[in-house]
């Protein structure tokens, strides 16, 4: 799996999970979130060469097509596969609100 | 939706469905498929600017992050959303075989 266990241990130019810490206030302008101040969002990036973690039959076909037609611009792309939620705390006036935001943290990647 | 109805009608630099015809023999080296000779596989390509068809909460966050931090390299990517199968006919000796290959045709795209 193209997850932290693999990608953060290996120097990998191909599609892999990349570390990205997002500070809510500085990076997104969301000053009102009380906790956490930021989180490890991560992101996916890297090349998708022939059969590198291909997701669907189409991405496998596209990968093969690119190998045979290297001048082609149609190639698979490195995107998130597994995502996890993030729980935040903020205040509505003096009232605390805890909310779980779905699909906020990327845990693994794929070529799609 | 970033599908043929929208994308093939508009000249669009942003993430959109692009036409791609694949000839099994010439483009993939698959000489054994009897019918069809090829098919409209299509593919997804184009930029994923702020809020252009963002797929998940993470891709929306990444989109916002990129807008505020334009020097960042962490941006969403244009990939397939809806896929359809393709039915092929081939022969095992003289015995015809009809098979449905899943996820072979891209029908729409998204930024993920």
């Amino acid at each position: 799996a193209l997850d932290a266990a693999y990608c953060f241990r290996n120097v990998q130019d191909n599609c892999c999970l990349r570390p990205l810490y997002i500070d809510f206030k500085r990076d997104l302008g969301w000053k009102w979130i009380h906790e956490p101040k930021g989180y490890n969002a991560n992101f996916c990036a890297g090349a998708c060469p022939y059969l590198w973690s291909s997701d669907t039959q189409h991405s496998r076909v596209l990968s093969l097509y690119n190998t045979i037609n290297p001048e082609a611009s149609a190639s698979p792309c490195c995107v998130s596969q597994d995502l996890e939620p993030l729980t935040i705390l903020y205040y509505i006036g003096k009232t605390p609100k805890i909310e779980q935001l779905s699909n906020m943290i990327v845990k693994s990647c794929k070529c799609s | 939706a970033l599908d043929a109805a929208y994308c093939f009608r508009n000249v669009q630099d942003n993430c959109c469905l692009r036409p791609l015809y694949i000839d099994f023999k010439r483009d993939l080296g698959w000489k054994w498929i009897h019918e069809p000779k090829g098919y409209n596989a299509n593919f997804c390509a184009g930029a994923c600017p702020y809020l252009w068809s963002s797929d998940t909460q993470h891709s929306r966050v990444l989109s916002l992050y990129n807008t505020i931090n334009p020097e960042a390299s962490a941006s969403p990517c244009c990939v397939s959303q809806d896929l359809e199968p393709l039915t092929i006919l081939y022969y095992i000796g003289k015995t015809p075989k009809i098979e449905q290959l899943s996820n072979m045709i891209v029908k729409s795209c998204k930024c993920s």
């Epitope: 997104l28 302008g29 969301w30 000053k31 009102w32 903020y90 205040y91 509505i92 006036g93 003096k94 009232t95 609100k97 909310e99 935001l101 | 702020y50 809020l51 909460q57 929306r60 966050v61 916002l64 807008t67 505020i68």
Partner: antibody, heavy 121, light 107 residues
Framework: EVQLVQSGAEVKKPGASVKVSCKTS????????MNWVRQAPGAGLDWMGQ????????NYNEMFEGRVTLTADTSTSTAYMELSSLRAGDIAVYYC??????????????WGQGTLVTVSS | DIVMTQTPPSLSVSPRETASISCRAS??????????MHWYLQKPGQSPQLLIY???NLESGVSDRFSGSGSGTDFTLRISRVEANDTGVYYC?????????FGQGTK
């Protein structure tokens, strides 16, 4: 230039619903809370509720008895306010107003031009 | 809910004079070193516009003839050297507690 442009005036029958839109431009829609405020003829301002467009989190004023629904479309940077079970007391000008940005519940620094909703049988 | 009471309900002021509007909250709107009180002006036929943020901070683009003061429950908006263009309804607003609430206005 920050702009909030609301949909036009509406005339509705008692018991019906109305949906008012607020199309924004000139700022990053996902960065700010969007509030809705109403003003009955010759009266003051009543806060109805707010939405955070990035993921659709909402807070409502209980005064509106669950009749109000706030939504947002990030792809078009547009906020919506739907008010159901309309009655004569709902005749008012409805405003969308952007939150200042420091707190979830905050002052409002930019306002739409207002949408007059009339309820008449 | 916090109730905001403005006085006077209406006010007539001659040009170049100073006008004062009071706003009293039913409970303190101070938290974390801030007073969560704001002032707006709604000119005839227009939408409200923010004048003062957090009790005393002049909003960008607003004339420095407007000033705000106060803390806890008692707040004041002052308009010096009043002009005809200042005509309208002035509202105070608190956001210290949910629901956010406005005063009834001073004309």
């Amino acid at each position: 230039e920050v702009q909030l442009v609301q949909s036009g005036a509406e005339v509705k029958k008692p018991g019906a619903s109305v949906k008012v839109s607020c199309k924004t431009s000139g700022y990053i829609f996902m960065k700010y809370w969007m509030n809705w405020v109403r003003q009955a003829p010759g009266a003051g301002l009543d806060w109805m509720g707010q939405i955070f467009p990035a993921w659709g989190s909402t807070n409502y004023n209980e005064m509106f008895e669950g009749r109000v629904t706030l939504t947002a479309d990030t792809s078009t940077s547009t906020a919506y306010m739907e008010l159901s079970s309309l009655r004569a007391g709902d005749i008012a000008v409805y405003y969308c107003a952007r939150g200042y940005g420091n707190y979830a519940l905050d002052a409002m620094d930019y306002w739409g031009q207002g949408t007059l909703v009339t309820v008449s049988s | 809910d916090i109730v905001m009471t403005q006085t006077p309900p209406s006010l007539s002021v001659s040009p170049r004079e100073t006008a004062s509007i009071s706003c009293r909250a039913s409970e303190s709107v101070d938290s974390y070193g801030n007073s969560f009180m704001h002032w707006y002006l709604q000119k005839p036929g227009q939408s409200p516009q923010l004048l003062i943020y957090l009790a005393s901070n002049l909003e960008s683009g607003v004339s420095d003839r407007f000033s705000g003061s106060g803390s806890g429950t008692d707040f004041t908006l002052r308009i010096s050297r009043v002009e005809a263009n200042d005509t309208g309804v002035y509202y105070c607003q608190q956001n210290d507690e949910d629901p956010l609430s406005f005063g009834q206005g001073t004309k």
